[in-house]
């Protein structure tokens, strides 16, 4: 059965946009004007996971690329990566846990918690041009709040 998906961009709470940094990494930086076209467009798929009024499980693929954000252990630390998948099999309604994020809406802001590693969140640094990463703290220096902008198909 087909998976419900939508196209969107994400900006952190400081209005930094997400762009590709090499083939398998995202970074966050402020963009303006025509540079906004550099930001990545996600295909957000609604998938199996814990669902409630303010929590929706999603997978974040890069639109028209066979790449998904995934959470894995590297050197015993939960780590965010872009993982290549077989486009014939993805997206699917029941994704492997490493691809699943709990999209949590709080006060019109979004958090993306790893389903594989509870209490670890997609994060950006205060500094410009730094990698998007998986962070284990909320409310500290690092930014875990995002806004979503819908993109027409």
């Amino acid at each position: 059965a087909p998976v419900r998906s939508l196209n969107c961009t994400l900006r952190d709470s400081q209005q930094k946009s997400l762009v590709m940094s090499g083939p398998y990494e995202l970074k966050a930086l402020h963009l303006q004007g025509q540079d906004m076209e550099q930001q990545v467009v996600f295909s957000m798929s609604f998938v199996q996971g814990e669902e409630s009024n303010d929590k929706i499980p999603v997978a974040l693929g890069l639109k028209e690329k066979n790449l998904y954000l995934s959470c894995v252990l590297k050197d015993d630390k939960p780590t965010l990566q872009l993982e290549s998948v077989d486009p014939k099999n993805y997206p699917k309604k029941k994704m492997e846990k490493r691809f699943v994020f709990n999209k949590i809406e709080i006060n019109n802001k979004l958090e993306f918690e790893s389903a594989q590693f509870p209490n670890w969140y997609i994060s950006t640094s205060q500094a410009e041009n730094m990698p998007v990463f998986l962070g284990g703290t909320k409310g500290g220096q690092d930014i875990t709040d995002f806004t979503m902008q819908f993109v027409s198909s």
Partner: antibody
Framework: QVQLQQWGAGLLKPSETLSLTCAVY????????WSWIRQPPGKGLEWIGE???????NYNPSLKSRVTISVDTSRNQFSLSLSSVTAADTAVYYC?????????????WGQGTLVTVSS | QSVLTQPPSVSVSPGQTASITCSGD??????AFWYQQKPGQSPVLVIY???KRPSGIPERFSGSNSGNTATLTISGTQALDEADYYC?????????FGGGTKLTVLG
């Protein structure tokens, strides 16, 4: 309170087609997936397939060539058809609901229908 | 075909802890679910998404899932917990059940 009530022929001859229907009472029909599972006597559970309100299906590969699951949203019903049955298809057949709030798994089940295939 | 392997039987004394395992290739990268089935009855969901309990399921039921093994744990096992238990997970496009474990509460 959600209730799933199922019915269909309980005795079949080899090569005939098994037909079962499940009616859903209470709760929305369109927000869920609807599944069929079977259990041969004294054995474990086997997932047959599922359908959503729009008619999109997933089937167990081992049964796919013989199975059709259909839906009638106007009646809040869904049905199972299994063709060319043999004695190996003798089982209790269950219908069930897969809910997003439980991670798209089977949170409500029908009472089960014993289907016997015998010549 | 994907395979989920469970021990055919587990025995436990009343009040003790029962652990039922379910093993499968990279099972920890999928979500695991557990059902309880008593004789002549339809299965009942007792654990979903690895470790969550549906409303009405007692707190003594818990679950975990990592590596290649999911585990259903029943602490302070009671006589009424005697039943068959099935694990389940998703395999690409279809659901797979384990073979089932008969839990016997001794005494």
């Amino acid at each position: 309170q959600v209730q799933l009530q199922q019915w269909g022929a309980g005795l079949l001859k080899p090569s005939e087609t098994l037909s079962l229907t499940c009616a859903v009472y209470g709760g929305s029909f369109s927000d869920y997936y609807w599944s069929w599972i079977r259990q041969p006597p004294g054995k474990g559970l086997e997932w047959i397939g599922e359908i959503d309100h729009s008619g999109s299906t997933n089937y167990n590969p081992s049964l796919k060539s013989r199975v059709t699951i259909s839906v009638d949203t106007s009646r809040n019903q869904f049905s199972l058809s299994l063709s060319s049955v043999t004695a190996a298809d003798t089982a209790v057949y269950y219908c069930a609901r897969a809910s997003p709030s439980s991670g798209w798994t089977l949170d409500y089940w029908g009472q089960g229908t014993l289907v016997t295939v015998s010549s | 075909q994907s395979v989920l392997t469970q021990p055919p039987s587990v025995s436990v004394s009343p009040g003790q802890t029962a652990s039922i395992t379910c093993s499968g290739d990279k099972l920890g990268d999928k979500f695991a679910f557990w059902y309880q089935q008593k004789p002549g009855q339809s299965p009942v969901l007792v654990i979903y998404l690895d470790n969550k309990r549906p409303s009405g399921i007692p707190e003594r039921f818990s679950g975990s899932n990592s590596g290649n093994t999911a585990t259903l744990t029943i602490s302070g096992t009671q006589a009424l917990d005697e039943a068959d238990y099935y694990c389940e997970a998703w395999a690409d496009t279809y659901e797979v059940f384990g073979g089932g474990t008969k839990l016997t509460v001794l005494g």
